[in-house]
Interface confidence: low
């Protein structure tokens, strides 16, 4: 079927469009183009006769149309009126006619837009501003940008008039920004220049600096006032209600006690018509007063709170000094002094930070000291300790347990046996115990100020028979020539003798072996690989004796200097080279090879088939023990002779 395709469909004014004909029939006499959706002689643009290859303009021909032999029509220098439908009338040789209609739309190349505003100096929290994107253009889409970002979502921003108008209600100083608008249609998009919104605001409540309010007689008083304001504020000063001057700064040289009083700064914005004031009270001392320390936290909690100690009063041009425990301040990342040295901050206080603290003010002849201040640091309770440490008792003796936990204020204690509350005391006493008194003894310590509690549980066994002991170790994998190991025989029992055996023999005499803690603890200093033996402890009293299971010490060592085998260093060409590397090490080492410094495989054995003189060189075996963090290596030179030149025999 005959069809017309417009390329492009949307055309910019001044550009060109091609009405492309598809499925043109065979055996044609000629064809004509018409403006509109039907064949109308008055609206003929151009006709074309194939036989003569003659094009004839029609009444609607504008001089901008070109017809091609394939019936396509090119229209150049497009104008708005060209929008619409175009009909192709095809006359076949058999005089049977065919028609097809196509269309395109014409859009203007958009001009660069500009922004108009209904209010060039809006007042904060009072005025609205409406920006309008000019000119108004048919079939155009309008977009807005604030600081080159698309519009934020805000109830104070409203688009209207087909997005042509952007209204900001109740403007704020934060609306001072760069605004741009953009127009788009199917053939173009243009952005305006920026418009900067100038929002009038303030004055805010002024701030008077410096902040200090105490001065010494004879000093200069220099106060400065500032209030956020657009346009900038005009300032006035009043002392005790009496107008002084219309300046931003107030300067009074060589002040006396008579200059004490209330100082008021008034800020005025002539455009908004608003005034704001701030008052500061200035005290002038004839001589510096005795300093004193104020604290922002009288009962700080350990590891939780910070404490700021401030030396009062605040006096301008004064040197402040601090002492802790009658010493000058130690260097510590937890101690921080403010810029003027007036405030000492203790970050994350500990129980050792109690003080006493003193501050001083330097005057002409001496230093005035404050009274000392002690910090009451709340801490704990720490994990309570139950004493004595015995866990085995014989029937008939008295059980007397005492509990203690470091705490401020002092902890309150409770005792539980097998989870049942017994008494609220620091000591627990039970006379003439029996096997029935065996169980779990819990001491609970509570700090009422911090609300924290900690508990310790001890298993008490009352028995005539001693239990089977066990060995605990402080280091399960010691490193040779570096670590020490302490074995302890558990449990701790009253009136008990402790014994030790190594590989079934009593302890050898050695300066590296030491017994302590009533022979309960055996310490091996600077362990060696030969200490990797079976250790057994025994306990005995007048009634019974018992031995532990053996504990074997796993000593990490090596790697020692490796050995490469076979030892041969000369080979014949064509032989297989099979080098094996071994190093004493616990755990087993990792092996790697290098030939002439070039890394090879990570294996214990290096195999090269049919070697030649090209394989001459240095063969290095590297060993590393990840557990000890130690490395070792050995290098071997290999010489390969060409056949028949070997200095030795070959197999």
């Amino acid at each position: 079927k005959l069809t017309i395709e417009s390329t492009p469909f949307n055309v910019a004014e001044g550009k060109e469009v091609l009405l492309l004909v598809h499925n043109l029939p065979q055996h044609l006499f000629g064809y004509s183009w018409y403006k509109g959706e039907r064949v109308d002689g008055n609206r003929q643009i151009i006709g074309y006769v194939i036989g003569t290859q003659q094009a004839t303009p029609g009444p609607a021909y504008s001089g901008r149309e070109i017809i091609y032999p394939n019936a396509s029509l090119l229209i150049q220098n497009i104008i708005q009126n060209d929008t619409g439908f175009y009909t192709l009338h095809v006359i076949k040789s058999d005089l049977v006619n065919e028609e097809a209609t196509g269309q395109f739309r014409v859009y203007p190349e958009l001009p660069k837009p500009s922004i108009s505003s209904n209010n060039s100096k809006p007042v904060e929290d009072k005025d609205a501003v409406a920006f309008t994107c000019e000119p108004e253009t048919q079939d155009a889409t309008y977009l807005w940008w604030v600081n080159n970002q698309s519009l934020p979502v805000s109830p104070r921003l409203q688009l209207s008039n087909g997005n042509r108008t952007l209204t900001l209600f109740n403007v704020t100083r934060n609306d001072t920004a760069s605004y741009k608008c953009e127009t788009q249609n199917p053939v173009s998009a243009r952005r305006s220049d920026s418009v900067i919104l100038n929002v009038l605001y303030g004055p805010d409540a002024p701030t008077i600096s410096p902040l200090n309010t105490s001065y010494r007689s004879g000093e200069n008083l220099n106060l400065s006032c500032h209030a956020a304001s657009n346009p900038p504020a005009q300032y006035s000063w009043f002392v005790n209600g009496t107008f002084q001057q219309s300046t931003q700064e107030l300067f009074i040289p060589n002040i006396t006690v008579n200059n004490s009083g209330s100082y008021t700064c008034q800020a005025h914005n002539s455009d908004t018509g608003l005034n704001r004031t701030t008052v500061t009270t200035i005290t002038v001392y004839a001589e510096p007063p005795k300093p004193f320390i104020t604290s922002n936290n009288s009962n700080p909690v350990e590891d939780e709170d910070a404490v700021a100690l401030t030396c009062e009063p605040e006096i301008q041009n004064t040197t402040y000094l601090w002492w802790v425990n009658n010493q000058s301040l130690p260097v510590s990342p937890r101690l921080q002094l403010s810029n003027d040295n007036r405030t000492l901050t203790l970050l994350s206080v500990t129980r050792n930070d109690v003080g006493p603290y003193e501050c001083g003010i330097q005057n002409k002849l001496s230093v005035d000291h404050s009274d000392p201040v002690i910090l009451n640091v709340l801490y704990g309770p720490d994990d309570p300790t139950i004493s004595p440490s015995y866990t085995y008792y014989r029937p008939g003796v008295n059980l007397s347990l005492s509990c203690h936990a470091a705490s401020n204020p002092p902890a309150q204690y409770s005792w539980l046996i097998d989870g049942n509350i017994q008494q609220h005391t620091q000591e627990l006493f039970i006379s003439n115990i029996t096997e029935k008194n065996s169980g779990l003894y819990t001491c609970q310590a509570n700090n009422s100020a911090s609300g924290h509690s900690r508990t310790t549980v001890k298993t008490i066994t009352v028995s005539a028979e001693l239990p089977k002991p066990s060995i605990s170790s402080n280091n399960s994998k010691p490193v040779e020539d570096k670590d020490a190991v302490a074995f302890t025989c558990e449990p701790e029992a009253q009136n008990t003798t402790y014994l030790w055996w190594v590989n079934g023999q009593s302890l050898p005499v050695s300066p590296r072996l030491q017994l302590s803690n009533g022979n309960r603890t055996l310490t091996l200093f600077n362990v060696t690989r030969n200490d990797a033996r079976a250790y057994v402890c025994g306990i005995q009293n007048s009634v019974s004796a018992n031995r532990s299971d053996p504990v074997t010490l796993d000593v990490l060592y090596g790697p020692d200097t490796p050995i490469i085998s076979p030892p041969d260093s000369s080979y014949l060409s064509g032989a297989n080279l099979n080098l094996s590397c071994h190093s004493a090490s616990n755990p087993s080492p990792q092996y790697s090879w290098r030939i002439n410094g070039i890394p090879q495989q990570h294996t214990q054995v290096l195999f090269i088939a049919k070697i030649t003189p090209n394989n001459n060189g240095t063969y290095a075996c590297f060993v590393s023990n990840l557990a000890t963090g130690r490395n070792n290596s050995i290098v071997k030179s290999i010489t390969v002779s060409a056949s028949g030149t070997s200095p030795g025999l070959s197999a």
């Epitope: 949307n10 977009l143 970002q149 199917p186 173009s188 998009a189």
Partner: antibody, heavy 120, light 106 residues
Framework: QVQLVQSGAEVKKPGASVKVSCKAS????????MHWVRQAPGQGLEWMGW????????EYAPKFQGRVTMTRDTSISTAYMELSRLRSDDTAVYYC?????????????WGQGTLVTVSS | DIQMTQSPSSLSASVGDRVTITCRAS?????MHWYQQKPGKAPKLLIY???NLASGVPSRFSGSGSGTDFTLTISSLQPEDFATYYC?????????FGGGTKLEIK
């Protein structure tokens, strides 16, 4: 005819910066915006921003704000895109594209692409 | 940012089939562009401003839609049409592309 020729592939370490160039011919660079679009391996297309070579104005995608800098040298008809503080997920092919300043931001001319690999 | 969701993400079809690819925007956009990309090559513009065929693109490609829903249609698939197709919105910064639709031979 319009042509955009980009600089060659780059391999960079994390934390480093890369600067890709795009030389234009067949049109006046001042009459166009130069856009930059990237494509991570096996992923889709991601627009980074544009520069107006006439005055140096830029528009960056928020994702790249603070890390990307687009510049130009009109005397040699070349646009540049520099990306700093590189991460491994910046590995991508970076394309420059020409778009008319009045145009509706579509890209009918593309550079051949520059592969930037970020690896430690 | 306006998110562009293309469906389907991949599609198997035969030569001669009619194929439709959909692109949905997370908020309303004014126009949509479509690109075709073949492996190892830069993308190629197919359709701009929703329905306009780019220069040299065959008429079997067409585009339509408005608001948030747009479609690319290939009326009769040809062997050279097997590629990945991307949509792109141009209404709001940052400009964003769809995740792509890979068109494969069945």
């Amino acid at each position: 005819q319009v042509q955009l020729v980009q600089s060659g592939a780059e391999v960079k370490k994390p934390g480093a910066s890369v600067k890709v160039s795009c030389k234009a011919s067949g049109f006046n660079i001042k009459d166009s915006y130069m856009h930059w679009v990237r494509q991570a391996p096996g992923q889709g297309l991601e627009w980074m921003g544009w520069i107006d070579p006439e005055n140096g104005d830029t528009e960056y995608a928020p994702k790249f704000q603070g890390r990307v800098t687009m510049t130009r040298d009109t005397s040699i008809s070349t646009a540049y895109m520099e990306l700093s503080r590189l991460r491994s997920d910046d590995t991508a092919v970076y394309y420059c594209n020409e778009g008319t300043p009045t145009g509706p931001y579509y890209f009918d001319y593309w550079g051949q692409g520059t592969l930037v690999t970020v690896s430690s | 940012d306006i998110q562009m969701t293309q469906s389907p993400s991949s599609l198997s079809a035969s030569v001669g089939d009619r194929v439709t690819i959909t692109c949905r925007a997370s908020s309303s956009v004014s126009y949509m562009h479509w690109y075709q990309q073949k492996p190892g090559k830069a993308p190629k513009l197919l359709i701009y401003s929703t329905s306009n065929l780019a220069s040299g693109v065959p008429s079997r490609f067409s585009g339509s839609g408005s608001g948030t829903d747009f479609t690319l249609t290939i009326s009769s698939l040809q062997p050279e049409d097997f590629a990945t197709y991307y949509c792109q919105q141009r209404s709001s910064y940052p400009l964003t592309f769809g995740g792509g639709t890979k068109l494969e031979i069945k």
